[in-house]
């Protein structure tokens, strides 16, 4: 990563905790931990107080004296209070929280079944290419490529677990070795932690509410990411996973047994058929270097059909391929035999949209992703709103002490554990570790779970994937049991092997301080959180699978020098941060080298420049949807997008401290300020505030 | 209807060779195998090879390999057996005879050709 | 090579009698035997294939039998026009070989 100052705002110290939280965070009282705030130096430091010349804290919080961005914030109870109320009201009151409950429960429902859907669409853009990274075995023996084939495959089809059946596959049939298949499971497991930090960019509305989120989806692209920089080279040096699975095949003998109840799909399969069906097989074909398979289309178009098992003579290359003498014969030049010859039959299509349209996989599956990232943006909107205006007061209140409230002293460090079997549990309820990830993002975002409950219960989510995994190895069969039983367990040691390295102690809880330097970054330049994911996601793997075609000397030759560039800055980064005095002067800070390169402020500039010309295009649109939304929401004062005035005129309203967001790469600023006086007869729900940064209204 | 006319009765001296031909009516050509056997006076019946006239593919007798050539004319749906380096005991009536499709009984016969062989 | 040995070489039997001829493999062929029936100075004529599929226009009284390595052919009353050679054909592999045929006479 660039040296950016910005990320000095991550937390850097792993013993501060939340502190908006209840309960018993620290040892420190509430009232005593502004004072308890310290320097390098131990010296106490004020909020408001500027840290030393090489931190860059300053770039980045906003916020106003006294708080901190990461505290949660407090859900204030902005209705009138029950007692008040008279029966009317109150009926009125129990009806609304029934309808709210019952709209969060259909959005939920909405939510998930348009990220399945947003699965399929990945598959029909990418699937087939995704095959086709496996079909080149040359390539998955260096084990760089291989994990970086994981990334972009399971980012292409947006399921690990397609990947690991493709992966099984290969490794069931000899096409793939299962040391081969490590990293690439490693990969697969990266390019999993991609779909919450999609999610997260929908709620890029709300600076704060978009630090939390975003900081609580990347928590695990980072543990994932630093699990894989320390594992990958011990996997390859000593073969641990391996030799460990192994051991674990060997001791225990498994026999053959039920999958993990689909207790999820079993709900939203009837709604996600009817939109579209997929034949993931094809993909399979695919990777396993079948070459007709690249003219088959991925979309299901057959549903129901008959298998028939009809005896037929077929002629076979010698006798050795018979059965038996009695079922072989010659016609005097061919060897004939009778095989039992399967013929499908087709009864009835299936029954989703796309079944009678003609059109290419490419087209289906752009559609499908433009609807199912406007659909699932809507959700989370809807979501957040309705959360927002559920969990106020007392709720929140119960809510956010149930979650976040650590055991009591000297059991407060079972609590994170606990955390991660919830998280293990939820998933495998759900039977995805994508679907409980993403859920669980926008309570991050409007702040019912902090970042530090968040990271175990996204390691435990980590660990239940891997559950269903192992399951559905032992549902295998026979011939590919131990295959994929062997690769589930790599997967699963590979999740507790990073928990053993990023959890248990406090300090080494890496991924947390990251995620919030990432959060903090995104929070100021949300383009940056844009980039980070093409770049991590699909730039970097991309590359690398690039430099992998042309051999191992170029990988070498080209990654070494960046890896040790990195280092190098890692290294200045930490000395600049412990202990500057031992650097000469113009080291202590980046101001050495050119802004550019040490502050995302000129890109900043760079981004708005080009995104300002689409803005004011697409503005006058937006105010035009703005007053729609209000109309449909009954919201009287509702304030629309300012963005057809003058850039002047912003920077006035931005001075004159009038809460219009500032014109950034995603900014709207649609309906940005709720109507507190709406709150009595109005659904709080529909009362909107800071609808998104989203173009989607 | 089926009908396979052999050519006429032939007398070579040993080491000659022999053509003899087979012409078919009656049916699709190229999708049956055709096969000859021999008859050698007052004996059994003793098979020498087959032809697929669809590929030209054949299969000979172990016995007779390096000596016989099957070959097939699809234009004029027309089959030939060669018999080379000719001996006395090669003296025989040869038939065509159409193998059924996918084994090898052969349902339909030419007439017959009579080689003699004799110094 | 499969030899097939065909019992009895010569049989003289009646009109309107019941007649078997066996036919024995050297080894399993299945069911991939053939029965002709050959008249002096003409080409053998297909009976049955398959041990026991009579072949088109072929007269219910001929029928085969037997699996593996021991077939029979029964004429199960012997007409005039029956008195010829018969000859078994296996056809489990190559080369295709017959049997020394029996030859049917009358009594």
């Known amino acids: 990563m660039a040296p950016w100052p910005e990320l000095e705002n991550a937390q850097p110290n792993p013993g501060k905790f939340i502190e908006g939280a209840s309960g018993p965070q620290s040892s420190i009282p509430a009232k005593d931990k502004e004072a308890s705030k310290t320097n390098d130096n131990g010296t106490p430091v004020a909020k408001t107080e500027l840290l030393p010349s090489y931190s860059a804290l300053v770039l980045i919080e906003e916020h106003p004296e006294g708080t901190d961005p990461w505290d949660l914030p407090e859900l204030q109870d902005t209705g009138i209070k029950w007692s008040e109320r008279d029966t009317k009201g109150k009926t009125l009151c129990i009806f609304q929280g029934v309808g709210k409950f019952i709209l969060l429960l259909g959005f939920l429902y909405l939510f998930v079944c348009s990220l399945d859907v947003l699965s399929s669409a990945f598959q029909l853009v990418g699937g087939k290419v995704a095959g086709q990274f496996f079909s080149n075995n040359s390539i998955m023996s260096n084990p760089v490529a291989g994990l970086v084939i994981g990334v972009l495959v399971t980012v292409m089809v947006q399921s690990s677990s397609t990947s690991s059946s493709i992966i099984v596959s290969m490794v069931a049939s000899s096409l793939l070795t299962v040391r081969a298949a490590i990293p690439i499971i490693m990969g697969a497991n990266i390019g999993t932690s991609i779909t919450n930090t999609i999610v997260a960019l929908m709620q890029a509305g709300d600076r704060n509410e978009f630090r939390r989120a975003f900081a609580g989806a990347t928590v695990h692209d980072f543990f994932n990411w630093l699990s894989v920089f320390v594992l990958l080279p011990l996997e390859a040096a000593t073969h641990y996973l391996e030799i460990l699975t192994n051991l674990v095949l060997e001791t225990f003998k498994f026999q053959n047994g039920e999958d993990a109840p689909d207790i999820l799909k079993v709900i939203t399969d009837p709604f996600t058929k009817l939109i579209i069906q997929l034949d993931k097989k094809v993909i399979q074909q695919i990777a396993m270097g079948d070459s007709a398979a690249q003219n088959k289309s991925l979309i299901k178009i057959w549903c129901k059909s008959i298998t028939n098992v009809t005896e037929m003579n077929v002629t076979v290359p010698s006798t050795d391929n018979c059965t038996s003498p009695s079922y072989c014969w010659t016609d005097g030049i061919q060897t004939w035999t009778i095989q039992n010859v399967t013929q499908k039959e087709n009864i009835a299509k299936c029954q989703h949209i796309f079944v009678n349209f003609s059109l290419p996989d490419l087209a289906v599956g752009i559609i499908l992703l433009t609807v199912s990232l406007v659909v699932l943006c809507g959700c989370l909107i809807m979501i957040v709103k309705l959360l927002g205006s559920v969990l106020r007061g007392q709720v929140a209140t119960v809510i956010k002490k149930t979650l976040n409230t650590d055991f009591p002293f000297p059991f407060a460090w079972l609590t994170g554990y606990l955390a991660i079997l919830v998280g293990a549990g939820m998933t495998f309820i759900v039977q995805s570790s994508s679907v409980f990830t993403s859920a669980m993002t926008p309570l991050i975002g409007i702040g019912v779970i902090s970042i530090e409950r968040a990271y175990p219960l996204t390691l435990g989510s980590n660990i239940g994937t891997t559950t269903t995994a192992i399951l559905a190895a032992l549902a295998s069969p026979g011939n590919t049991l131990r295959s994929s039983l062997q690769i589930a367990l790599c997967h699963f040691f590979f999740n507790i092997s990073g928990i053993l390295l990023w959890y248990p102690i406090p300090f080494t809880r890496l991924p947390i301080r990251l995620a919030k330097g990432l959060g903090n970054i995104s929070a100021k330049y949300r383009w940056f959180a844009v980039f980070y994911l093409i770049f991590f996601f699909f730039v970097t793997p991309l590359t690398v699978f690039g430099l992998s075609l042309a051999g191992w000397p170029v990988l070498v030759g080209v990654g070494v020098p960046i890896i040790l560039l990195l280092l190098l800055v890692l290294c200045l980064r930490m000395l600049q941060f412990r202990c500057p005095r031992i650097l000469p002067l113009k080291l202590r800070d980046w101001n050495f080298l050119p802004l550019w390169m040490h502050s995302l402020k000129p890109w900043d500039n760079v981004i708005s420049l080009a995104t300002t010309c689409f803005q004011r295009r697409c503005c006058c649109c937006c105010r035009v949807c703005c007053r729609v939304c209000c109309m449909v929401c009954g919201c009287k004062c509702c304030r629309c997008s300012k963005c057809c005035r003058d850039q002047g005129e912003e920077e006035e309203e931005k001075e004159q401290d009038i809460p219009v967001k500032a014109s950034g790469a995603f900014d709207n600023a649609a309906m940005s300020k709720e109507c507190q006086d709406e709150g009595k007869g109005q659904v709080e729900v529909l009362s909107m505030k800071a609808l998104s940064n989203t173009t989607v209204f | 209807q089926v009908q396979l006319v052999q050519s006429g009765a032939e007398v070579k001296k040993p080491g000659a060779s022999v053509k003899v031909s087979c012409k078919t009516s009656g049916y699709t050509f190229t999708t049956n195998n055709m096969h000859w056997v021999r008859q050698a006076p007052g004996q059994g019946l003793e098979w020498i090879g087959a032809i697929y006239p669809g590929s030209g593919a054949t299969a000979y007798n172990q016995k007779f390999k390096g000596r016989v050539t099957m070959t097939a004319d699809t234009s004029t749906s027309t089959v030939y057996m060669e018999l080379s380096s000719l001996r006395s005991e090669d003296t025989a009536v040869y038939y065509c005879?159409?193998?059924?499709?996918?084994?090898?009984?052969?349902?339909?016969w030419g007439q017959g050709t009579l080689v003699t062989v004799s110094s | 090579d499969i030899q097939l040995t065909q019992s009895p070489s010569f049989l003289s039997a009646s009109v309107g009698d019941r007649v078997t001829i066996t036919c024995k493999a050297s080894q399993d062929v299945g069911t991939a035997v053939a029965w002709y029936q050959q008249k002096p100075g003409k080409a053998p004529k297909l009976l049955i294939y398959w041990a026991t599929t009579r072949h088109s226009g072929v007269p219910s009284r001929f029928s085969g039998s037997g699996s593996g390595t021991e077939f029979t052919l029964t004429i199960s009353s012997l007409q005039p026009e029956d008195f010829a050679t018969y000859y078994c054909q296996q056809y489990s592999s190559n080369p295709l070989t017959f049997g020394q045929g029996t030859k049917l006479e009358i009594k």
């Open positions: 005879a159409r193998g059924m499709y996918g084994h090898g009984a052969m349902d339909y």
